[in-house]
Interface confidence: medium
């Protein structure tokens, strides 16, 4: 008599997450009498997947009617596949008894599940940095299978090369995660710049997933300061201007000091944006020269985005201003810091 064969024709089956998987199994003989059971994995820790006689297997259905006479097809269909269903499935023939005795197993069919990566999430540095400094951006995507995946970084459309990428775990798994770090050198023009993390995977039909981050959230552009004096007015008042230019973000406080004493404090708000995304702000201070005996030292002090204050000083020479109307001013700029250095 010919020995019973349990035939699983497919070595492997690959399906997309959410689809159904058909696992084929036929037997070569109806003898001996006894049930067929499906297991995932082999050995003592194997998991029962389907048993016609007993149990509740809501996602598993037989492909053909196993109750009909002379049925030799014990193929099953598993619906709504998830990555957790990956593994090797065995069709096993038992001899009827008390208890039933395992007689023969099929060679096994490896089910691999193709799962899409999650939308890449890009995170930037916790604190802002200034131009010429390097900041790191991280991109993460999870839950994909198979392991092969491509991740690229772009800044304003140009691919970045200072990148380190890891796919975990290193060994075999039902699904994988990717984490990549890109290092970007900031420039003063980067307020409107964007970094993109692009993930390509076979499940995406050639349409990569993208995650983005705006460099505006990572950059601080410190201001340039310039203090100038306008011509003296007829009423012996000098108009001194503090121009604060090319700064980002907008958060800025300006304080005028006259001979070291606070004269006025202003907060920048609702400023128009320059083309490059930075801001400018101009503040005026009127100094009544006739009220001073000595030269007046004016200081424009700017605190930008919580950073240490930057000062720009200017001396108005009272001695150079006779008390008659309409005379011209002579002023000396004694300031040094034209911009903040970090």
């Amino acid at each position: 008599e010919e020995e019973l064969q349990v035939i699983q024709p497919e070595k492997s089956v690959s399906v997309a997450a959410g689809d159904s998987a058909t696992l084929n199994c036929t037997v070569s003989s109806l003898i001996p009498v006894g049930p067929i059971q499906w297991f995932r994995g082999a050995g003592p820790g194997r998991e029962l997947i389907y048993n016609l006689k007993e149990g509740h297997f809501p996602r598993v259905t037989p492909v053909s009617d196993p109750t009909k006479r002379n049925n030799m097809d014990f193929s099953i269909r598993i619906s709504n596949i998830t990555p957790a269903d990956a593994g090797t499935y065995y069709c096993v023939k038992f001899r009827k008894g008390s208890p039933d005795v395992e007689l023969k197993s099929g060679a096994g069919t490896e089910l691999s599940v193709r799962a899409k990566p999650s939308a890449p999430v890009v995170s930037g540095p916790a604190v802002r940095a200034t131009a010429e400094h390097t900041v790191s951006f991280t991109c993460e995507s999870h839950g994909f299978s198979p392991r092969d995946i491509t991740l690229k970084w772009f800044k304003n459309g140009n691919e970045l090369s200072d990148v380190q990428t890891n796919v975990d775990p290193a060994g075999k798994s039902v699904s994988y995660s990717i984490r990549s770090t890109a290092r970007v050198v900031l420039t003063r023009r980067d307020v409107h710049s964007q970094v993109i993390c692009e993930v390509a995977h076979v499940t995406l039909q050639g349409d990569p997933l993208r995650g983005t981050a705006n460099l505006s959230e990572a950059i601080r552009v410190p201001p340039f300061l310039e203090v100038t004096q306008q011509s003296m007015r007829a009423d012996n008042q000098v108009n001194v201007t503090c121009q604060v230019t090319k700064f980002y973000p907008q958060r800025l406080q300006l304080t005028w000091l006259e001979n070291g004493n606070v004269s006025r404090t202003e907060m920048a708000s609702a400023l128009p944006e320059n083309k490059d995304g930075t801001y400018n702000w101009t503040s005026w201070l009127l100094v009544n020269v006739s009220a001073h005996r000595d030269d007046v030292k004016l200081t424009c002090q700017v605190e930008h985005d919580g950073q240490p204050a930057v000062n720009k000083s200017f001396s108005v020479k009272v001695s150079a201003h006779p008390k008659e109307q309409g005379s011209n001013t002579a002023a000396e700029n004694t300031g040094t810091n034209e911009r903040n250095i970090y």
Epitope: S14, L204, G206, D207
Partner: antibody, heavy 118, light 109 residues
Framework: EVQLLESGGGLVQPGGSLRLSCAAS????????MSWVRQAPGKGLEWVSI????????YNADSLKGRFTISRDNSKNTLFLQMNSLRAEDTAVYYC???????????WGQGALVTVSS | QAVVTQESALTTSPGETVTLTCRSS?????????ANWVQEKPDHLFTGLIG???NRTPGVPARFSGSLIGDKAALTITGAQTEDEAIYFC?????????FGGGTKLTVL
């Protein structure tokens, strides 16, 4: 049943243009990347172009130097290949093929013959 | 551009196992090349057999299987049938383009 039916082939003079169509049925075109592959008389297969499922991304053979453009109308379940500046060496049977995922040519059309000759 | 090389012709007998291979000029074929195997029968009838190295297209007989053997992609027909006589093309993916091999003419005598 999945079916791919190419049309638009024919005889064209060197330097001329031709537009091939591939009508897809039995599946939703937008869910699949699609490709054009050609076979010159007595030769093997040469890959021409791929369009991603949405049509937003395309990949083309460098050898074609931008003369061919792949596109699709997912609402009409149709893939296209616009061929410009045709040369004698473009004479071939052009096949459209469906990609299961992005790495798996599963179904092929019956082909459309393009002959470039004066 | 990479060159993909296949045996030009192979002959087997019904019931025998035959293996066709596919070599890349750039080095070892890996899973990232997503090896495909396509069958051409007379009258330009093409059928995708294997994709992504080892995934068999639904409806393709179980005797066809794909794998990597050494540094090459391989198509194995276990128990060849007379109807398997055809030309078999492999295709490999290189980052942004596919390259087909020249094809293997399989004769089943």
């Amino acid at each position: 049943e999945v079916q791919l039916l190419e049309s638009g082939g024919g005889l064209v003079q060197p330097g001329g243009s031709l537009r091939l169509s591939c009508a897809a049925s039995g599946f939703t075109l937008s869910s699949y990347a699609m490709s054009w592959v050609r076979q010159a008389p007595g030769k093997g297969l040469e890959w021409v172009s791929i369009s991603s499922g949405s049509g937003a991304n395309t990949y083309n053979a460098d050898s074609l130097k931008g003369r061919f453009t792949i596109s699709r109308d997912n609402s009409k379940n149709t893939l296209f290949l616009q061929m410009n500046s045709l040369r004698a060496e473009d004479t071939a049977v052009y096949y459209c093929a469906r990609l299961r995922f992005f790495d798996w040519f599963d179904y092929w059309g019956q082909g459309a013959l393009v002959t470039v000759s004066s | 551009q990479a060159v993909v090389t296949q045996e030009s012709a192979l002959t087997t007998s019904p019931g025998e196992t035959v293996t066709l291979t596919c070599r890349s000029s750039t080095g070892a074929v890996t899973t990232s090349n997503y090896a495909n195997w396509v069958q051409e029968k007379p009258d330009h009838l093409f059928t995708g057999l294997i994709g992504g190295t080892n995934n068999r297209t639904p409806g393709v007989p179980a005797r066809f299987s794909g794998s990597l053997i050494g540094d090459k992609a391989a198509l194995t027909i276990t128990g060849a049938q007379t109807e398997d006589e055809a030309i078999y093309f492999c295709a490999l993916w290189y980052s942004n383009h596919w390259v087909f091999g020249g094809g293997t003419k399989l004769t089943v005598l």
